[in-house]
Structure formats: structure tokens, C-alpha cells
């Protein structure tokens, strides 16, 4: 009984004056509260509470659910307790069999005793089945049995509060023990896309896939720099023990330019968080950006191959795509292709390839690509490098000797002259007039040179070389003179071809 | 003893509004998942909705979505059904139930509290 | 969404009788089948979870089996109060569906 300091207020004094009381089942309970400012008895046991308002609690005929801790309240708070045991050989337990535990927390199995005296107060296995070898517990008679730090290995666990009575064990009903599991890592997340990029008025749905070991994870989507709560969906997935799969679907239902930026999903338990981002760029209308992989203006060897390349950026994607020359279409000799597989790539190649190309096929070659937002084009030059071909060499009424060569780089003309039977033209010989020809041909065809000299100037028996020659090449064309008196003639005129 | 108390049923025109509240007790509020399940008269069980512990995940039928809203006060241990947009067929008792351990169903209902759509 | 087929929709029994309700769900859900039990005017009681699981409180005559798509709930010997509706329920996946009852009636 609690001593009384004179001039505080003190406890309640309860009849009988003893902390525990043991009663038989059938029996009177007869509790006196005595205090001049009483207020109620309570009486709890597992989650049951009563009051009484009287300051006598009487219970004519004990049953084992009275058994239980009575306590007697004044009006200034102050409080005195009895437990009551109500010995009942036929009900040893009282439970409930509602049992959760947090992983390595402490968790109480709730089958307090309704006698104090039997022994062997413990846990068993169901079914005879021992208790895990790491499971500790600590009895108390008036609570239950606590389990010390529950393991997650213990989920499930199916237990009987157990007693020795008379010699014989007596087991209460059974438990099953459910494992809330502790956070022992950030959760995992994954993000259906890295980024999209949509047209203004298109919708933007983007995925989050949150995994954990429980479905009291955290998840949310957030904006970067923005408190706006965003408008989610969710679905959630148990595929088994402490796997738990939840999906956060973002929408927005019709995107705008200013609601490009960057989008995370968050989630976090009691461990840490997690977090993983996708980023949302919204165009106004649709683009194509072409980027040639080489020059624009090509120049290539005659008999040679060269590949056309462009990449470009097309969003939506490319619908049509053609390589064109002189008005006609390439049906084959040209490849498009995406730059890489990913479901998010807008980047795309084309190549055309031309091969053992010749003087008359240089020109301009187009890459023409459309989507169903806009076209764009692009222009390749190709020069074709041909090595000069002499046209004509004449002897012209007007004693003039004329060379008119083509090729292209354009050819420089030279004129020599040889005296004699001599096999190598060294002299020089300048041209009276120079002049390059337009070509009836293509654009970016052959280029055409007149060279002319005079005749008049040779006095002796021999031969003129016209040479005609650029970058890839050199070719000759001869005139032979011999004099018959005063008369000169021109033999028959003669090339040689030098590679 | 774990205890769950529905309120906020009652009559209520098409289109209208009405908010059911879930008092919890006797259980750690915020460790459990909650849903909202009825019953319309004569007829089977549907589940509504369920949030999270945290309230940080809703769920909904198809049925609802885009009319129910279902909230939590964890600071309260109070479950809300926020129902617009009523129709006849929405007339039903409304149960709260806890979640139990997850995936393994709902293991305290409240005695429901029923919603007539009737003009 | 995932469908719930429970079936018979209702069936008589006596007392003592065993009792077998099906239900099927249209894709697999593991082991996340739960029962109910309903009276009228009253709040549906969980008999069992995770399809085999037997809910603290409940009979023992009571027993679930199944994985997958097809689950069983068996009242090995039927009594006075078991006498009720029962819905199967999915919590593989959400949205969580029941099944659409199965009423026991007296014979």
C-alpha cells in the first residue's frame, strides 16, 4: 500500500492490500477502492477495458476472462492497481491471436495466464515442430510471451503459448506470427523512358516502377523545382514474401512547350530513398535537322566509288525518304536506317553509294526525307575527276593548229615542237589563244579548252605536240610538218595516249 | 481491440457529393494499407478503393475513377471516401477494411455505413 | 483487370455435409487468394488468406487450396452458423476484384 505524505494528495488504498490476487473460477471477486476523492475502477486485460464507477468492484461468480489488472483512480490522477488471477484449470490462457511483429523489433504473444502457479511458461513449435534456434522469448504470466528481435526468417511462424500442469504440457490455441520486414536497402526504381520528346497537344504518359520489401514504401512523382502535386495512377503487384512491386504512372494528358523539364520519381522508407528521372521536351510542331557526314561538294575519280551520308533528326518520324539525280529517283543503291535501336532514338542514316562512277554522271545528288510535319532536303555536288580526252586537232585554213581537250579538273593545254626525228618535244611553243568552251553536256560534266598557235612559225621539218593535262592525267596529239620547197604540209595527225 | 467506425452515409441526389469517414482504433493506423468496399443492395461485394500507409499510393475501380478520392489523417487514424458525381448505382454500404499483412486480405471491416442515389 | 469466376453462384447443404466453392481467376495471381464469409445485415469475416491460410479465430473445418488460377475453399463438415455467402478475392494485383459470391443454404 502506498505511504501518505501529509498535506500531498495520495494514492487510492485497495482492499485486499496485496499487488497480485489469486481467486478460483466460480469465486467472489471483491475489490474496495478507498479514497475520499474517488473517481472509477478500470479494468484491462489484453485490449478489453472496463470501468466501474463504484468504489467497490464486485464479481459474483469469477470466470478466467476476469482475470486482468484492476486499477482504482482518484481525482487527482493518482492511481493503485491489483492483478487478479482467476485460476481455471480448464482455460489456463487468455488470447489474442492477432500477432505482428516488426523485423528486429520485440513483438508480445498476448496469452497471459489465468493461474500464476503452473510452470514451464514458454513457446512451442505447432504440430511438435521446434522453434527456430536463434528464436529468444521472455515469459510474463500478467502480458504474454515477448519474442526478442524478430527475424524475417520467423514470417509466418506458426506458435502455441505452452504450460506444465500437474506433469502435463497444455498448449493455448495457436499463433501465426506475421513479419512486417524492416527497410534494409533504398528502394529500387526504374523509369519506363529516360526522356521523350512530343508535339505540343500529344499526351505524355511516363511510368515509375518502385520494388521493395513491403508496400508501406513511399513513391511519388515530382517535378524538378515545382511543388505541384502531379496527377498519378498506380497499380502495385505482390509476388510473394517481401516482394512488393508498385507502378506510379504519370499523365498529362495534353503536353505543353512549358511543361518540358525534368520529372522524378521519388520513393523512400525508413532506410533511405531512391530516385530516378525522365525528361519531357515538347515541340511546338514537328522538325527534320539533316547533318551531312561528309563534304557537300564531293570530288571523286573517275571509275571510283563514293558514299553519299547524311544523318538527321526527324521527329515525328521520317515517313519518306529518296535520293535523287537528275530528276530521277534511286529505287536501289541506297540504304536508311535508325542510328540506334533505342525506342526514344529520332537520329537516322542514309547513305547512297555510287559506285565506278563516270565523267558523265557528276551532278547534283539530293537526299530528300519528310514526316508528317515537314520536308527537308539536302545537296550533294559531285565532281567526277576524268583525265583529258582530245577532242579535235586541226590544221585550220588559216594556218592556225588547233587542240580542243575536256576533262575535268579543266585541262591545261601545252604546245611543243620537235625538229626533226627528235622523239622528245622540249620547246615550248605559246599559244596565240586560249580559250575555255561552255559544254553542251550536264552541270558538273567534262570542261572543254581551245588552244590554238600559230603554224607559221615553223621553218623546218618536225612534229607539234599538243598535251593536254589536270590532276588525274596527261594525253598527246602530234602534227608532223614537211617542207616541199617553199610549201608546207601536214602530214596525217596522231595521239598518244599517256597514262 | 481493433475497431473500425464508418460515418457520413445518408441520401443524396445524382451528382452530388457526400464524404464517408473511417474511424481507426486499437492498431498502429499508419502501418496498414485501408480500401473502401460495397455492397449494393442484394448483391456481391466490390472493392472501391485502397491507399497506402503512408498515403502516398491510391488505388481505385474502374467504376470510380475520376469521381472518389480516398484520403488518409494519419495523425487523426481517419480514413476518407470523397464521392462525387454520385450515381443511382452507387447506392450501396460502404465498408472500411484494414489491410492486413500485405497481400493477404482485409482482416478488420467496419459494420458499413450505406449511401442512397436517389433523386 | 483481373476476373474472379466463383461458382456455384449458390448451393443446399445440410449439417455435417462437406462443401466445396470454386473460384478462377482469368491470369495467374500466386498464392494471393483470400475468403470471405458474409451473414446478412453484416460485415464480411476473413476466413482464409493466401489461398491455404487459416485466419486466427477460424474453425479448423474450414481449409483453402489452389495456386495460380484455380482455388477451392472446403467446410469440411457444415454447421448451424456456416450457413452464409462467401466471396473469393484477389490481392495479387490491384485493382483487388471478389468473386461474385457463393450463397449456402440450408437443404
Known amino acids: 500500500q502506498p505511504s501518505v505524505s501529509p498535506g500531498e494528495p495520495s494514492p487510492p488504498s485497495i482492499h485486499p492490500g496485496k499487488s497480485d490476487l489469486i481467486v478460483r473460477v466460480g469465486d467472489e471477486i471483491r475489490l474496495l477502492c478507498t479514497d475520499p476523492g474517488f473517481v472509477k475502477w478500470t479494468f484491462e486485460i489484453l485490449d478489453e477495458t472496463n470501468e466501474n464507477k463504484q468504489n467497490e468492484w464486485i464479481t459474483e461468480k469469477a470466470e478466467a476472462t476476469n482475470t486482468g489488472k484492476y486499477t482504482c483512480t482518484n481525482k487527482h490522477g493518482l492511481s493503485n492497481s491489483i492483478y487478479v488471477f482467476v485460476r481455471d484449470p480448464a482455460k489456463l490462457f487468455l488470447v489474442d491471436r492477432s500477432l505482428y511483429g516488426k523485423e528486429d523489433n520485440d513483438t508480445l504473444v498476448r496469452c497471459p495466464l489465468t493461474d500464476p502457479e503452473v510452470t514451464n511458461y514458454s513457446l512451442k513449435g505447432c504440430q511438435g515442430k521446434p522453434l527456430p534456434k536463434d528464436l529468444r522469448f521472455i515469459p510474463d504470466p500478467k502480458a504474454g510471451i515477448m519474442i526478442k528481435s524478430v527475424k524475417r526468417a520467423y514470417h509466418r511462424l506458426c506458435l502455441h503459448c505452452s504450460v506444465d500442469q500437474e506433469g502435463k504440457s497444455v498448449l493455448s490455441e495457436k499463433f501465426i506470427l506475421k513479419v512486417r520486414p524492416a527497410f534494409k536497402a533504398v528502394p529500387v526504381v526504374s523509369v519506363s523512358k529516360a526522356s521523350y520528346l512530343l508535339r505540343e497537344g500529344e499526351e505524355f504518359t511516363v511510368t515509375c516502377t518502385i520494388k521493395d520489401v513491403s508496400s508501406s514504401v513511399y513513391s511519388t512523382w515530382k517535378r524538378e523545382n515545382s511543388q505541384t502535386k502531379l496527377q498519378e495512377k498506380y497499380n502495385s503487384w505482390h509476388h510473394g514474401d517481401f516482394n512488393y512491386e508498385r507502378q506510379a504512372t504519370l499523365t498529362i494528358s495534353s503536353a505543353r512547350v512549358n511543361d518540358s523539364g525534368v520529372f522524378m520519381c521519388y520513393a523512400n522508407n525508413t532506410f533511405g530513398s531512391a530516385n530516378v528521372t525522365t525528361t519531357l521536351e515538347v515541340v511546338d510542331k514537328g522538325f527534320i535537322n539533316i547533318f551531312p557526314m561528309i563534304n557537300t561538294t564531293v570530288f571523286v575519280n573517275d571509275g571510283e566509288n563514293v558514299d553519299l551520308i547524311v544523318e538527321y533528326e526527324a521527329f515525328p518520324k521520317p515517313e519518306h525518304q529518296q535520293w535523287i539525280y537528275m530528276n530521277r529517283t534511286f529505287t536501289d543503291k541506297w540504304e536508311d536506317y535508325p542510328k540506334s535501336e533505342n525506342e526514344s532514338n529520332i537520329r537516322y542514316v542514309s547513305e547512297l553509294h555510287l559506285t565506278r562512277l563516270k565523267g558523265t554522271e557528276g551532278g547534283t545528288y539530293t537526299f530528300l526525307v519528310s514526316n508528317s510535319d515537314v520536308n527537308a532536303a539536302i545537296a550533294f555536288n559531285v565532281y567526277v575527276n576524268t583525265k583529258p580526252e582530245i577532242l579535235t586537232y586541226d590544221r585550220l585554213v588559216n594556218g592556225m593548229l588547233q587542240c580542243v581537250a575536256a576533262g575535268f579538273p579543266e585541262p591545261t593545254i601545252d604546245w611543243y615542237f620537235c625538229p626533226g626525228t627528235e622523239q622528245r618535244c622540249s620547246a615550248s611553243v605559246l599559244p596565240v589563244d586560249v580559250q575555255t568552251l561552255n559544254s553542251s553536256g550536264p552541270p558538273f560534266g567534262k570542261l572543254v579548252v581551245q588552244s590554238s598557235i600559230d603554224s607559221s612559225a615553223f621553218k623546218h621539218n618536225g612534229t607539234v605536240e599538243c598535251k593536254a593535262y589536270n590532276d588525274v592525267g596527261k594525253t598527246s596529239a602530234y602534227f608532223n610538218f614537211a617542207f616541199k620547197g617553199n610549201n608546207k604540209e601536214q602530214i596525217h595527225p596522231h595521239t598518244l595516249f599517256t597514262p | 481491440e481493433v475497431q473500425l467506425l464508418e460515418s457520413g452515409g445518408g441520401l443524396v441526389q445524382p451528382g452530388g457529393s457526400l464524404r464517408l469517414s473511417c474511424a481507426a482504433s486499437?492498431?498502429?493506423?499508419?502501418?496498414?494499407?485501408m480500401s473502401w468496399v460495397r455492397q449494393a443492395p442484394g448483391k456481391g461485394l466490390e472493392w472501391v478503393s485502397a491507399?497506402?500507409?503512408?498515403?502516398?499510393?491510391?488505388y481505385y475501380a474502374d467504376s470510380v475513377k475520376g469521381r472518389f478520392t480516398i484520403s488518409r489523417d494519419n495523425s487523426k487514424n481517419t480514413l476518407y471516401l470523397q464521392m462525387n458525381s454520385l450515381r443511382a448505382e452507387d447506392t450501396a454500404v460502404y465498408y472500411c477494411?484494414?489491410?492486413?499483412?500485405?497481400?493477404?486480405?482485409?482482416?478488420?471491416w467496419g459494420q458499413g455505413t450505406l449511401v442512397t442515389v436517389s433523386s | 483487370d483481373i476476373q474472379m469466376t466463383q461458382s456455384p453462384s449458390s448451393l443446399s447443404a445440410s449439417v455435417g455435409d462437406r462443401v466445396t466453392i470454386t473460384c478462377r481467376t482469368s491470369?495467374?495471381?500466386?498464392?494471393?487468394l483470400n475468403w470471405y464469409q458474409q451473414k446478412p445485415g453484416k460485415a464480411p469475416k476473413l476466413l482464409i488468406y493466401?489461398?491455404?491460410r487459416l485466419e486466427s479465430g477460424v474453425p479448423s473445418r474450414f481449409s483453402g487450396s489452389g495456386s495460380g488460377t484455380d482455388f477451392t475453399l472446403t467446410i469440411s463438415s457444415l454447421q448451424p452458423e456456416d450457413f452464409a455467402t462467401y466471396y473469393c478475392?484477389?490481392?495479387?494485383?490491384?485493382?483487388?476484384?471478389f468473386g461474385g459470391g457463393t450463397k449456402v443454404e440450408i437443404k
Open positions: 477494411a484494414r489491410g492486413a499483412y500485405d497481400g493477404e486480405g482485409f482482416d478488420y
Open positions: 486499437g492498431f498502429t493506423f499508419s502501418d496498414y494499407p
Open positions: 491507399i497506402g500507409g503512408s498515403g502516398g499510393d491510391t
Open positions: 491470369q495467374s495471381i500466386g498464392s494471393y
Open positions: 493466401s489461398a491455404s
Open positions: 478475392q484477389q490481392t495479387y494485383n490491384t485493382p483487388w476484384t
